[in-house]
Interface confidence: medium
C-alpha cells in the first residue's frame, strides 16, 4: 500500500521485494526540505548495515530479494514518506 | 588525518581482566562502526566484535561473547574492549580498526597500531 | 562460518617476478578484500571488494576471482612488497584468511 496509517506505539514492518538479484538493497526516509536521507542498508542477506539515521528502526534481510524495515515502536516523528532502493 | 591511537601494552595474571582502549581522531566518531581484531603469532587475525559509538549497538563474533564487552565515549571518541577470565590463550596483539564503506560494503580501512597482552602468571 | 584458505603459506619470489597469491572460500563470498602487514605494523588496506586498489596502492597490485576463488596478483615484485598478506570477507560476520607471507629473495 502507498498509504499506511498507524498508532502511535505499534510495531510496524515496511516491505520492500526485488526481482532483479541486486545485491544491495537500501531503505531511506523523504522529508520536505531534508531530502533522502538513508535509514538502513544491506549489502547481502543478513548483512544490515546503519545509514545516515538510523535510530528508532530496525531491519531485516533474510532473503536477497527482501528488505524489511521495522518501526519497532511508532512515533509521530516517523511520520514520511519511505522509499526503497535496490542496485548491484 | 585519521588515526586511532591505542593504550600501552598489558600484562595481567590469569583469571584477571584487561581493558584496552582506542582514541579516534580526524573523522565523526559517532557515525563509524569500530571494531577490534586478534592477531595471534602465526595464528592470522580474529574478528572479535564492533561498536556503533552513535547508539552503543554491538556485534560480538560467538567465539568472544560472553568474554569481550565493548563500550565506547562518545564525549572523548574512545573505543573499549574488556576480556575477563584471561588465560594463556588471550596473549596476542589486539588492534581497533574502523568501518569504511566501499560500494556499499564494510572494509577496515583504519587501524590502531596495536596492544600488545601477555597473559602470565 | 566462511572459512578462507590462503596458499602457499609461505612465497619467496625474485625482484621483478609476477606473482600470484590465492584465497579460496568454503562457500561463495560476493566480495573479497586484501590486506598487507609488513613486520611489526598494523595491516593496511591493500584492495577492496575484490579487485579496486585502496588509496595509495601501487598499480604492480591487482586483484580477481568470483564466488569461492580469488587472487592476488603482483605483476613486478619489489622489496617493499615483502610482508604478510589476508584476505578478509564479510558474510554474516568477518573472517580472514590465514595469510601469505611474501619473501624476497
Known amino acids: 500500500s502507498r498509504y499506511l496509517v498507524k498508532r502511535t506505539g505499534e510495531k510496524v514492518f515496511l516491505e520492500c521485494v526485488q526481482d532483479m538479484d541486486h545485491e544491495n538493497m537500501f531503505w531511506y526516509r523523504q522529508d520536505p526540505g531534508l531530502g533522502l536521507r538513508l535509514i538502513y542498508f544491506s549489502y547481502d542477506v543478513k548483512m544490515k548495515e546503519k545509514g545516515d539515521i538510523p535510530e528508532g528502526y530496525s531491519v531485516s534481510r533474510e532473503k536477497k530479494e527482501r528488505f524489511s524495515l521495522i518501526l519497532e515502536s511508532a512515533s509521530t516523528n516517523q511520520t514520511s514518506m519511505y522509499l526503497c532502493a535496490s542496485s548491484l | 588525518q585519521i588515526q586511532l591511537q591505542q593504550s600501552g601494552p598489558e600484562v595481567v595474571k590469569p583469571g584477571a581482566s584487561v581493558q584496552i582502549s582506542c582514541k579516534a581522531s580526524?573523522?565523526?566518531?559517532?557515525?563509524?562502526?569500530m571494531n577490534w581484531v586478534k592477531q595471534r603469532p602465526g595464528k592470522g587475525l580474529e574478528w572479535i566484535g564492533r561498536i556503533y559509538p552513535g547508539d552503543g549497538d554491538t556485534d560480538y563474533s560467538g567465539k568472544f561473547k560472553g568474554r569481550a564487552t565493548l563500550t565506547a565515549d562518545k564525549s572523548s571518541s574512545t573505543a573499549y574492549m574488556r576480556l575477563s577470565s584471561l588465560t594463556s590463550e588471550d596473549s596476542a596483539v589486539y588492534f581497533c580498526?574502523?568501518?569504511?564503506?566501499?560500494?556499499?560494503?564494510?572494509?577496515?580501512?583504519?587501524w590502531g597500531q596495536g596492544t600488545t597482552l601477555s597473559v602470565s602468571s | 562460518q566462511i572459512v578462507l584458505t590462503q596458499s602457499p603459506a609461505i612465497m619467496s619470489a625474485s625482484l621483478g617476478e609476477e606473482i600470484a597469491l590465492t584465497c579460496s572460500a568454503n562457500s561463495t563470498v560476493g566480495y573479497i578484500h586484501w590486506y598487507q602487514q609488513k613486520s611489526g605494523t598494523s595491516p593496511k588496506l591493500l584492495i577492496y571488494?575484490?579487485?579496486n586498489l585502496a588509496s595509495g596502492v601501487p598499480s604492480r597490485f591487482s586483484g580477481s576471482g568470483s564466488g569461492t576463488f580469488y587472487s592476488l596478483t603482483i605483476s613486478s615484485v619489489e622489496a617493499e612488497d615483502a610482508a604478510d598478506y589476508f584476505c578478509?570477507?564479510?558474510?554474516?560476520?568477518?573472517?580472514f584468511g590465514g595469510g601469505t607471507k611474501l619473501e624476497i629473495k
Open positions: 580498526a574502523r568501518s569504511g564503506y566501499f560500494n556499499y560494503v564494510p572494509v577496515f580501512d583504519y
Open positions: 578478509h570477507q564479510w558474510s554474516f560476520y568477518p573472517t
Open positions: 580526524g573523522y565523526t566518531f559517532s557515525g563509524s562502526w
Open positions: 571488494t575484490t579487485s
